[in-house]
Interface confidence: low
């Protein structure tokens, strides 16, 4: 037989299909010019020493073969002995290691069999009524096609589906959309209405994310507040990566999940901007304020569920960084300034009350005064911190108050509002005999003691009403009792107590008179 002809003899190997898992498959045959035809196939398994034979049976029942050698593609003309105008059945037999492996058969009319291309170029993916819609440009001169898709998830094998007939310059397909797993799709086409025409190759993978982006499973930790009044938010656990089907691993455009970090600064509500959205990879520095943090996942189909955390305020307080002076015109606060042209936010709230009751005030950008201090003043009429109770004060600073992540904490401290010196006066002062020359003086804690760090000390004053001599005794702010000794029997004394802050001397309590009775010996 001539090599260019289909040989109508028995092939040069025994006729037996081994039933092996490897072998030839995906046979495709089509017309490539007015009188030339091509068949191609794939071979699965080791290729060393394999010889391929293209088999053809005519409608008359006569069969022939082409010897392709080790090639998996073969061309022949309409003069090769194969009937191109009538239906023929073709298959490939591969002879290897003393056994024959056989491909599935294709039955077609070669003259009308056109080589169809799979969808080429950009396949657009969108969501339509809970399904996946794929759309692509029809390859040139190939309008009129039957289209199939196959899809798989990371844990399931390929499943086949039909897109139906297509007859336009653009083709489309509705496919199942998985809620929670990524999918890989491939598409193939064949000539519409041509009996037995060959399918094209499968297209390149189209990788599709799940309808719902995965919920971000991340954990945060917040570092200690640094000297600059800022603390770093760090990611303890990266979001879990979406598991991808085999053909989407590596580069998988379309399945990307983006994670964004949404910050909401709860403290200092009088500032201009309370929320900011950032990329998750860019972990911000925060002030010591309270924040809500949300991680939002999204993919090409939109946003998914988010995960939210509350980051509580840093409650570490500075002992004396804040100076407060109360004058007739009002009250002024002084603190070490941060830098030139800083905006400060002063926030205060009564201790023991819900954070929602915080009040704040924003200063205009200010430079340090000659002593390097920043100030904030308010009048008595404004009512700010006017009640005689303990307030928690936090001062934040920023050179760019419109940028949420550039605020820092200057200080946090406690302050007793209103007329602290009078309100702090200790009450219920009582005197009890202790010994022949001493007494124990007790009093109820000053209201100032409810305000951490405000009460510096108590002072107990004892006055000898005879000699008018006065002695004063400092007492630790945590104590509410002192023993006065060296007293004389029969002498009248008065005792008073006052409570002092770091910058204010308290008001003396009502004088309490007492004397130690003279002991009469028998």
């Amino acid at each position: 037989c001539r090599t260019s002809e289909c040989c109508f003899q028995d092939p040069p190997y025994p006729d037996a299909d081994s039933g092996s898992a490897s072998g030839p498959r995906d046979l495709r045959c089509y017309r490539i010019s007015s009188d030339r035809y091509e068949c191609s196939w794939q071979y699965e398994g080791p290729t060393a020493g394999v010889s391929h034979f293209l088999r053809c049976c005519l409608s008359s029942g006569r069969c022939c073969y082409f010897a392709a050698g080790s090639a998996t593609r073969l061309q022949f003309s309409d003069q090769a002995g194969v009937s191109v105008l009538y239906t023929v059945t073709l298959w490939v037999e591969s002879w290897a290691r003393n056994q024959t492996e056989k491909s599935p058969e294709v039955t077609l009319q070669l003259y009308n069999s056109v080589k169809y291309e799979p969808p080429l170029g950009d396949i657009k993916v969108s969501k339509l009524a809970g399904q996946l819609r794929m759309e692509w440009e029809t390859p040139d001169n190939q309008v009129g096609a039957e289209v199939q898709f196959r899809h798989r998830t990371p844990s399931s094998p390929w499943k086949l589906g039909d897109c139906g007939p297509q007859d336009d310059d653009t083709e489309s397909c509705l496919c199942p959309l998985e809620m929670n797993v990524a999918q890989e799709f491939q598409l193939r086409r064949r000539q519409l209405g041509s009996q037995g025409s060959s399918w094209s190759k499968w297209s390149s993978p189209v990788c599709v994310p799940p309808e719902n982006p995965p919920q971000p499973q991340v954990r945060f930790s917040v570092e200690q507040l640094g000297q600059d009044g800022r603390r770093r938010l760090t990611l303890k656990e990266q979001p879990t990566q979406l598991e991808l089907p085999e053909g989407c691993q590596g580069l998988a455009p379309g399945t990307e999940v983006t994670y964004r970090l949404q910050l909401h600064m709860l403290s200092c509500p009088c500032k201009a901007k309370a929320t900011r959205t950032l990329h998750l990879g860019k972990m911000p520095y925060l002030s010591g304020a309270a924040y809500n943090v949300a991680v939002i996942s999204s993919n090409q189909f939109g946003p998914g569920l988010n995960q939210t955390w509350h980051i509580p305020a840093d409650t570490h307080t500075e002992p004396v960084a804040l100076n407060i002076s109360v004058g007739t015109n009002g009250t002024t606060m002084y603190w070490p300034a941060r830098a030139q042209s800083m905006t400060y936010c002063i926030e205060w709230q009564p201790v023991g009350q819900d954070g929602g009751l915080a009040t704040c005030s924003l200063t205009a950008p200010q430079d340090p005064d000659p002593a390097g201090m920043a100030t904030y003043s308010w009048s008595r009429e404004s009512g700010a911190m006017g009640q005689e109770k303990c307030y928690y004060i936090t001062i934040f600073a920023s050179a760019h108050p419109e940028k949420l992540t550039l605020w820092s904490t200057v200080l946090s401290t406690y302050h007793f509002g209103g007329n602290a010196s009078a309100a702090g006066t200790p009450h219920h002062v009582s005197v009890k005999n202790h010994s022949l020359d001493s007494v124990s003086v007790d009093w109820a804690p000053s209201l100032l003691s409810t305000c951490p760090g405000v009460l510096k000390e108590y002072v107990v004053r004892c006055r000898d009403e005879d000699s008018k001599q006065v002695s004063e005794h400092p007492v630790q702010p945590t104590e509410t009792q002192v023993t006065l000794s060296g007293l004389r029997a029969g002498v009248a004394y008065t005792v008073q107590v006052r409570a002092d802050t770091a910058w204010l001397r308290g008001v003396w309590s009502q004088p309490q008179r007492f004397s130690i009775e003279v002991q009469v010996s028998d």
Epitope: T153, S155, S156, P157, W158, P176, M179, N180
Partner: antibody
């Protein structure tokens, strides 16, 4: 109709291996994953792993890692599960189950194979 | 591993009754939950998948509901063939795990 037919009961000595087969019919064998599940006498069900008949890929439960091997022979549409270094607490009925298309739930089960491990 | 718990562990009912079995997962599993029926000496039979979808060929007297961590299987109008052990199974996270089973007995 879809059928999964398993091999017959076996009695094994501790330390030996048991190989159970599961022959599929009524569908394209390479299109659906097969899972293996076991049930000790009077106990509940325990998942062991799966095999993808299409390419031989497997995933085993951590508990059985190193002792279980799942294989398949596509020419006869049969999957195998071999458990080695048998212990008496491996005495159980072993089932193969087919995974549905489009989801990873099971739809069809084999009739089960009792493996008894006894000295 | 995800723990699956079922309640009650056993249940007595009469022919014609309607019964509900609950299944709880130790963490959220979406709707990746299946229910199986097992009669004595037989292989499990698949009833429900995806928490509420009926397997083909299973009568509509069986219904499932739930999502996340809490799920229920309801069987209406009990027949003698329905008295068996019912198992739930999560197939969201490896290893797939089954509930301990609920034994449904004739009163």
């Amino acid at each position: 109709q879809v059928q999964l037919v398993q091999s017959g009961a076996e009695v094994k000595k501790p330390g030996a291996s048991a190989k159970v087969s599961c022959k599929a019919s009524g569908y394209t064998f390479t299109d659906y994953y097969l899972h293996w599940v076991r049930q000790a006498p009077g106990q509940g069900l325990e998942w062991m792993g799966w095999i993808n008949p299409n390419n031989g890929g497997t995933h085993y439960a951590q508990k059985f890692q190193g002792r279980v091997t799942m294989t398949r022979d596509t020419s006869i549409s049969t999957a195998y599960m071999e458990l080695s270094r048998l212990r008496s607490d491996d005495t159980a009925v072993y089932y193969c189950a087919r995974e549905m298309g489009g989801t990873t739930a099971f739809d069809y089960w084999g009739q089960g194979t009792l493996v008894t491990v006894s000295s | 591993d995800i723990q699956m718990t079922q309640s009650p562990s056993s249940l007595s009912a009469s022919v014609g009754d309607r019964v509900t079995i609950t299944c709880r997962a130790s963490q959220g599993i979406g709707n990746y939950l299946a229910w199986f029926q097992q009669r004595p000496g037989k292989a499990p039979k698949s009833l429900i998948y995806a928490a509420s979808s009926l397997q083909s060929g299973v009568p509509s007297k069986f219904s499932g509901s739930g999502s996340g961590t809490d799920f229920t299987l309801t069987i209406s109008s009990l027949q003698p063939a329905d008295f068996a052990i019912y198992y739930c199974q999560q197939y969201n996270i490896y290893p797939y795990t089954f509930g301990p089973g609920t034994r449904l007995e004739i009163k």
